[in-house]
């Protein structure tokens, strides 16, 4: 399988609203025109698929309607946003990139982004 380098940040802190964003960058060896991006979560040595999208270069990146992910693409970069995160979702989020067309097929897997999610403290009741 032809390998491809994928870069992503080591650590990202989710916002208080449970939103985390990071960039996944791949070094395309050719004229990649159709790309599949998959976000995997690794926790306790288990890997699960968080979301995936296939896009043509120059077209928008569309995840399924019920996906917790959104994203945009620009050149060889994909800007990924994961929403609805809670403290229990803290873990290593791995970016997997496949160059689907034209041939040959290439696969690249990033080292992962450790996303830390801190549940917000409940607001104390206040008297005015």
């Amino acid at each position: 399988c032809k390998a491809m380098h994928v870069a992503q940040p080591a650590v990202v802190l989710a916002s208080s609203r449970g939103i985390a964003s990071f960039v996944c960058e791949y070094a395309s060896p050719g004229k990649a025109t159709e790309v599949r991006v998959t976000v995997l979560r690794q926790a306790d040595s288990q890997v699960t698929e968080v979301c995936a999208a296939t896009y043509m270069m120059g077209n928008e990146l569309t995840f399924l309607d019920d996906s917790i992910c959104t994203g945009t693409s620009s050149g060889n970069q994909v800007n990924l946003t994961i929403q609805g995160l809670r403290a229990m979702d803290t873990g290593l989020y791995i970016c997997k990139v496949e160059l689907m067309y034209p041939p040959p097929y290439y696969l690249g897997i990033g080292n992962g982004t450790q996303i830390y999610v801190i549940d917000p403290e409940p607001c104390p009741d206040s008297d005015f």
Partner: antibody, heavy 120, light 112 residues
Framework: QVQLVQSGAEVKKPGASVKVSCKAS????????INWVKQAPGQGLEWIGD????????NSNQKFEGRVTLTVDTSISTAYMELSRLRSDDTAVYYC?????????????WGQGTLVTVSS | DIVMTQSPLSLPVTPGEPASISCRSS???????????LYWYLQKPGQSPQLLIY???NLASGVPDRFSGSGSGTDFTLKISRVEAEDVGVYYC?????????FGGGTKVEIK
């Protein structure tokens, strides 16, 4: 339903250029690559190249490189193949075909073909 | 370029009888991702080619199940369990493991 409708037959002189059109309907034009394939009389199929309608990015067979230009006009959902410096062995039927990712980029719909005759 | 070689060149068939076409590639079309990048197309007389099989063994939508595809990395077979008159035409195998995409020379199936 999905349709690819190509322009009519052309007769050209050697050294001239020809531009074949392929109008797509029945699907979102920018969601699929368009391929071009040559079939010389009584012969098999030969891949010329492909184009991504979103950004005009192309890949082409080295055999045709330098003589073939693939373009699109997304406003009218039409792909074009222009072949320059025509020779007698360019006499052929030229097909456009849509690629389908669900079929791992097989050509699932084809135009009816355009016969290009190169003769002096 | 990957060379696709088909045999036989011509195949006379009897309606209701089975038929088999072979295709060989100069390089394995089985990728390490588990996908075999081999396709079959049929060009009926006076028509454009149509997709029959993708990924070596998967039938395209609307293709009758009397057609089936099988093979290894370099040797492939298209089988028609019971030939019908409408199956006549030229059958092409093709690969898209690498650019340029290449086709076999074709096998002409005709009724005896």
């Amino acid at each position: 339903q999905v349709q690819l409708v190509q322009s009519g037959a052309e007769v050209k002189k050697p050294g001239a250029s020809v531009k074949v059109s392929c109008k797509a309907s029945g699907y979102k034009f920018t969601d699929h690559f368009i391929n071009w394939v040559k079939q010389a009389p009584g012969q098999g199929l030969e891949w010329i190249g492909d184009i991504n309608p979103n950004n005009g990015g192309t890949n082409s067979n080295q055999k045709f490189e330098g003589r073939v230009t693939l373009t699109v006009d997304t406003s009218i959902s039409t792909a074009y193949m222009e072949l320059s410096r025509l020779r007698s062995d360019d006499t052929a039927v030229y097909y456009c075909a849509r690629l389908r990712r669900e079929y791992f980029y097989a050509m699932d719909y084809w135009g009816q073909g355009t016969l290009v005759t190169v003769s002096s | 370029d990957i060379v696709m070689t088909q045999s036989p060149l011509s195949l006379p068939v009897t309606p209701g009888e089975p038929a088999s076409i072979s295709c060989r590639s100069s390089k394995s079309l089985l990728h390490s991702n588990g996908i075999t990048y081999l396709y079959w197309y049929l060009q009926k007389p006076g028509q454009s080619p149509q997709l029959l099989i993708y990924q070596m063994s998967n039938l395209a939508s609307g293709v009758p199940d009397r057609f089936s595809g099988s093979g290894s990395g370099t040797d492939f077979t298209l089988k028609i369990s019971r030939v019908e008159a409408e199956d006549v035409g030229v059958y092409y195998c093709a690969q898209n493991l690498e650019l340029p995409l290449t086709f076999g020379g074709g096998t002409k199936v005709e009724i005896k």
